[in-house]
Interface confidence: low
């Protein structure tokens, strides 16, 4: 059977696959997924290895019409470096010379300057080019190679290994060489895979059942460290609770060098954030950190300095800490907007079972603002999702020059932010460089400011506007709000009406159904519309809802079904990749994110049309 990294190299014109008959004869044959001689895989960014021979495809020289055969894999050799050119061409790196079928006289695969159908190759059974099954470096653990990547294939006791192995060990631990010749260099590490005993690479906190892996012997950049954690279904460490910091201080107390954690400010327009999307609500900076120098966007935990944090350049090479298992966050379910009948007093705005009100004109210090909100039956607002934040920005009359108190503060416990209404902190969205918590002015309270409504800590004694939030009252007669400008069963948002199509349909069927309703499969113009749609479908039990996006017309170019430019995207991780198809919104934990599906899959869908009586704004000129 093929593992996910292996593939057959297929020429559609001949309907045949590449077959490594011997190291000196690389020919073609009828495709057979069980034939080892037809299996290949990338073993570096630019080398393709024959699984049968554990040798790499190469040429004797970069010359037109020379035979492509197999050579001992050498990552430095210019004659083994391949790259995908436009569409399905595979060429020797840096040259216009292509992997070619050969001809009737020449049965061997050849290097050739022609780029016709005989030089076009796909992964057998797919429409994808060979690079879509590309190489992913595997970072090692422990060992003696400072966390370097596995070098496949590697030689051990004169035998070649193209995968992690337990050869030479009695404990079954999987390892790899980190250079091609282990016999000479003796450099190795353990593989970030599940094997008997791999759990002992982790320390489990008995109180929370969260596991931590301390890789103090590694020397990786922040991005490499993160990749290594992700290869183990984990993430770089986030710390959201004081208990967690205390546990890690103990765990790292015998170490001296810094270790990467998930804290970073790599996002262009927002502040400090955890890579696993945990809220940044607990601060444990070293005095003098975070330094404002540009480039110091990644954070290390310093065992030698009481496990406090400092920001460094992400390219520095350090050890790192991974975290997996139950999140340390309390489980806290946010009801979706559509689940909750929301009735609010005059001048309060409804959203997801709560009512909100901006007090802009009566400026108050934080304590007095909180008192006012509580007198009105609520509290300073807490914010638990990006959708709730987007609601406040897009629908509550928030203005770009506003600076308004919200309920987040660290008055009770310094450097540990909590909501004044007692709800758990599940989400944060800090402005760039925030929270700064400048010690010379006690910045214990939090404001929303700027065009995106991101957050900054502030001295509590500033008189500012504020936002109140209270639970909606569900008593009293049911008020059925007629969505003005929309037909019954349609929901209005800004200038548009939306409807969920409840019949499971292919993309084409869904499109036709919307057209029959004088509507179209939904477009998504910006993050506010995305936030609305996420709240509209996000908590429904079905997994997917079709949008109007696809690359049916031109492979690789995603377009809406109506003539509208794609100005906003909200792809799920690893999307859109290279696979063609139609785009659906996820529900559940990845609510709202876009996945590419096969267009003939069946899913529910969202239709959209202009609300009646709405004047169309002018189309933006390009």
């Amino acid at each position: 059977l093929l593992d996910t990294r292996q593939f057959l190299i297929y020429n559609e014109d001949h309907k045949r696959c590449v077959d490594a008959v011997s190291p000196s004869a690389v020919q073609t044959a009828a495709c057979n997924q069980d034939a080892e001689s037809q299996k290949f895989r990338w073993v570096s960014e630019s080398q393709i290895m024959s699984v049968a021979f554990k040798l790499c495809l190469g040429v004797p020289s970069k010359t037109d019409w020379v035979a492509i055969t197999l050579y001992a894999c050498d990552s430095k050799s210019e004659f083994q470096k391949w790259e995908c050119k436009n569409d399905t061409l595979l060429g020797i790196k840096g040259e216009d010379l292509f992997f070619n079928y050969g001809n009737r006289q020449e049965k061997n695969i050849m290097l050739y300057k022609g780029s016709g159908l005989w030089s076009r190759w796909k992964i057998y059974g797919t429409t994808d080019n060979l690079c879509s099954r590309g190489y992913e470096a595997m970072y090692t653990l422990l060992g003696n190679a400072n966390g370097a990547t596995c070098a496949f294939p590697f030689k051990f006791e004169n035998k070649w290994y193209a995968d992690c192995t337990s050869a030479g060990r009695s404990d079954g631990w999987l390892w790899c060489g980190t250079t091609t010749d282990y016999d000479t260099d003796k450099l190795f590490g353990y593989c970030p895979l599940k094997f008997e005993g791999s759990e002992s690479l982790w320390n489990k906190d008995p109180l929370t059942s969260v596991s931590y892996q301390i890789n103090s012997k590694s020397a990786l950049t922040w991005h490499q460290a993160r990749k290594s954690c992700q290869q183990q279904n984990a993430e770089l460490l986030s710390i959201t609770e004081i208990h967690e910091q205390t546990y890690l201080t103990g765990l790292t107390s015998s170490l001296t060098s810094g270790l990467w954690i998930g804290l970073n400010s790599l996002s262009f327009n927002s502040g400090w954030q955890w890579s696993d999307r945990s809220p940044f609500r607990y601060l444990n900076w070293l005095p003098g950190s975070p330094s404002a120098e540009p480039g110091k966007s990644c954070v290390s935990l310093n065992p030698g300095k009481n496990a406090k944090w400092e920001n460094l350049e992400c390219v520095q090479k350090l050890g790192y800490i991974c975290k997996k298992g139950n999140t340390t966050l309390n489980s806290f379910v946010i009801p979706s907007e559509s689940d909750v009948p929301t009735h609010c007093p005059s001048q309060w705005w409804p959203y997801a079972g709560h009512c909100y009100k901006i007090h802009r004109d009566e400026k108050k210090i934080q304590r007095d603002a909180l008192t006012t909100c509580r007198k009105e039956g609520g509290d300073l607002t807490s914010i638990h999702t990006i959708e709730e934040l987007d609601f406040i920005i897009s629908q509550l009359g928030y203005e770009p020059n506003d600076e308004l108190w919200i309920g987040l503060n660290d008055i009770k416990i310094q450097m540990y932010f909590e909501w004044s209404d007692g709800t758990p902190v599940t989400f944060t969205k800090w402005l760039r460089g925030e929270p700064s918590h400048e010690n010379n002015r006690q910045e214990d309270c939090v404001v929303m400011k700027g065009k995106d409504g991101y957050w900054a800590d502030r001295g509590c004694e500033w008189p500012l506007g504020y936002i109140c939030k209270m639970k909606s009252r569900s008593q009293g007669p049911e008020i059925v709000e007629v969505e003005k400008g929309c037909r019954k069963g349609w929901k209005k948002h800004h200038f548009y009406c939306y409807m969920i199509g409840h019949t499971l349909s292919t993309f084409a069927e869904a499109n036709q159904t919307c057209n029959n309703e004088n509507a179209y499969l939904t477009t998504i113009e910006d993050r506010y519309e995305q936030a609305f749609l996420t709240s509209f479908v996000g908590l429904r039990p079905e997994k997917y809802f079709w949008t109007g996006l696809s690359d049916i017309q031109t492979k690789g170019t995603f377009q809406w079904t109506i003539e509208e430019e794609v100005r906003f995207t909200h792809w799920n991780s690893d999307m859109p990749g290279r696979k063609p198809g139609c785009v659906a919104m996820r529900t559940g934990i990845a609510g709202g994110l876009w996945d590419v599906l096969k267009c003939d899959e069946k899913a529910k869908f969202v239709c959209k049309h202009w609300a009646e009586g709405v004047t169309h704004p002018p189309k933006p000129t390009t």
Partner: nanobody, 112 residues
Framework: QVQLQESGGGLVQAGGSLRLSCAAS????????MGWYRQAPGKQRELVAG??????HYADSVKGRFTISRDNAKNTMYLQMNSLKPEDTAVYYC???????WGQGTQVTVSS
């Protein structure tokens, strides 16, 4: 992936000026911040100037002489270098996302 290509280096007399350019291509939407670094023979690579959003940052040794700017429409960053000194001689590297992506470098030589 992001590709970066520097240009504008060369030989100049002390007190003269040069303007370096760095053109970004590929997944430029993923670029958050950019910077210029330099490496003189036998020395460590050092940050010369950085730009994040509208904020700029300069090494003390170049403050008042060098100006970093960015043209988002052209996906290009610039370094205007005035009052050049012999100690500015180095290979100048363009960088995006603080170390995630590097250019190949361009040689700047200031003769006395």
């Amino acid at each position: 992936q992001v590709q970066l290509q520097e240009s504008g280096g060369g030989l100049v007399q002390a007190g003269g000026s040069l303007r370096l350019s760095c053109a970004a291509s590929g997944s430029t939407f993923s670029i958050n911040n950019m910077g210029w670094y330099r490496q003189a023979p036998g020395k460590q690579r050092e940050l010369v100037a950085g730009i994040t959003g509208g904020n700029t940052h300069y090494a003390d040794s170049v403050k008042g002489r060098f100006t970093i700017s960015r043209d988002n429409a052209k996906n290009t960053m610039y370094l205007q270098m005035n009052s050049l000194k012999p100690e500015d001689t180095a290979v100048y590297y363009c960088n995006a996302n603080w170390g995630a992506y590097w250019g190949q470098g361009t040689q700047v030589t200031v003769s006395s």
